[in-house]
């Protein structure tokens, strides 16, 4: 039994890191393998992650971690019974994929303005709380070409757009994702989408 693709890990910079790897053949990850991990820290202890299958030869492990700080470094040991298959390390702050924003809501009762709000996925004491920026994707269910992205580069988790920038009388969906420039993160997954019917009063045209 050998590792074909070494484990690669990403952290949510909060409490979970996800490691994926591939074996050289079909493997029952949960019965044959164990991933041991330990924070390099005087008061830490070793933990064991039981991997799950991720395709025939693929394995994935969800590591429960202490609240992350930038200096953290974890040792990783992949075992098959008594055989050490791979040894490595992982710095969560160097491989961050933020959590997805939640609670996306479209407020349509603000005088021909659409107000989209969502929740920051981190608690205020987390470093990423004040460093997230967002991308909001709005698209029409009727017209695949009517697809737009709004970049929200300020900290407030909200976006205002004029209802008239979208077509009236049809349904739209929106979703939002996050990233943090400070740690050069990847984008988060998209939030669940939310749907609304766009309608607004056409301005009265005088002739």
């Amino acid at each position: 039994m050998k590792v074909l693709q070494e484990p690669t890990c990403v952290s949510d910079y909060m409490s979970i890191s996800t490691c994926e790897w591939k074996m050289n053949g079909p493997t029952n990850c949960s019965t044959e393998l164990r991933l041991l991990y330990q924070l390099v820290f005087l008061l830490s202890e070793a933990h064991t992650c039981i991997p799950e299958n991720n395709g025939g030869a693929g394995c994935v492990c969800h590591l429960l971690m202490d609240d992350v700080v930038s200096a953290d470094n974890y040792t990783l040991d992949l075992w098959a019974g008594q055989q050490l298959l791979w040894k490595g390390s992982f710095k969560p702050s160097e491989h961050v994929k933020p959590r997805a924003p939640g609670n996306l809501t479209v407020h349509t009762n603000v005088s021909d303005t659409l107000l989209l709000t969502w929740s920051n996925p981190y608690p205020p004491d987390n470093y990423l709380y004040n460093h997230l920026t967002y991308a909001v994707n709005i698209w029409s269910e009727n017209d695949p070409a009517d697809f737009r992205i709004y970049n929200v580069t300020y900290l407030e988790p909200s976006l205002r757009i004029a209802a008239s920038t979208l077509k009236s009388g049809i349904s739209y969906r929106a979703r939002v994702r996050a990233w943090a420039q400070c740690y050069n993160t990847t984008w988060s997954e998209w939030s669940p989408s939310t749907k609304w019917h766009n309608s607004y009063r056409e301005p009265f045209e005088q002739h």
């Epitope: 409490s15 390099v40 820290f41 005087l42 008061l43 830490s44 202890e45 971690m65 202490d66 609240d67 700080v69 930038s70 200096a71 953290d72 608690p123 004491d125």
Partner: antibody
Framework: EVQLVESGGGLVQPGGSLRLSCAAS????????MFWVRQAPGKGLEWVSG???????SYADSVKGRFTISRDNAKNSLYLQMNSLRAEDMAVYYC?????????WGQGTLVTVSS | EIVLTQSPGTLSLSPGERATLSCRAS???????LAWYQQKPGQAPRLLIF???SRAPGIPDRFSGSGSGTDFTLTISRLEPEDFAVYYC??????????FGQGTKVEIK
């Protein structure tokens, strides 16, 4: 908002015992290492003890064998049992949250050791 | 045990001046584990700098940290009235644990 509130300080005679408590709120207590740091009157800061998320502990040489740190994750509480107290243990005792350094501190509780 | 020695013991300066505080370690310290704190009378310490040079959230940019190995510096570019306080450096070591310097008092001249 992160809050750490110490209690249990007071006047104790040399050789006596005291138990300090720290009530934590505003964060996931179980995922954080916790510490006690003290400051004698007019002196500098001294790290006393720390406890990891899994219960691993460490102590300054000056308190080893006399002090015991513990935590109750269900109650979001940190404790310091201090036995065989000496005059040099008189200090403000701070509860702190952190790891390699301490971003969050309580306001401290004063322990006076005097006969 | 790693010993941190801060100098000077007291720094007498006027508002608007630049303050340079030194922290010297008895053996090499990882920059990732070097921090600076500010403490005012009757208050708990406040983290200013971590990782030798990263400002903690909410700390004004007049505070900066630098250094590596055994020599570290905290600089306050222009002293404000609220900056007069005692400053401590602190290090963490995987075997020796946590130690603080003895402090530098920045007082009004």
């Amino acid at each position: 908002e992160v809050q750490l509130v110490e209690s249990g300080g007071g006047l104790v005679q040399p050789g006596g015992s005291l138990r300090l408590s720290c009530a934590a709120s505003g964060f996931t207590f179980s995922r954080n290492a916790m510490f006690w740091v003290r400051q004698a009157p007019g002196k500098g800061l001294e790290w006393v003890s720390g406890i990891g998320t899994g219960g691993a502990t460490s102590y300054a040489d000056s308190v080893k064998g006399r002090f015991t740190i513990s935590r109750d994750n269900a109650k979001n509480s940190l404790y310091l049992q201090m036995n065989s107290l000496r005059a040099e243990d008189m200090a403000v005792y701070y509860c702190a949250r952190g790891r390699y350094y301490f971003p969050w501190w309580g306001q401290g509780t004063l322990v006076t050791v005097s006969s | 045990e790693i010993v941190l020695t801060q100098s000077p013991g007291t720094l007498s300066l006027s508002p608007g001046e630049r303050a340079t505080l030194s922290c010297r370690a008895s053996q090499s310290v990882s920059s990732s584990y070097l921090a600076w704190y500010q403490q005012k009378p009757g208050q708990a310490p406040r983290l200013l700098i971590f990782g030798a040079s990263s400002r903690a959230p909410g700390i004004p940019d007049r505070f900066s940290g630098s250094g590596s190995g055994t020599d570290f510096t905290l600089t306050i570019s222009r002293l404000e009235p609220e900056d007069f306080a005692v400053y401590y450096c602190q290090q963490y070591d995987h075997s020796a644990g946590w130690t603080f310097g003895q402090g530098t008092k920045v007082e009004i001249k």
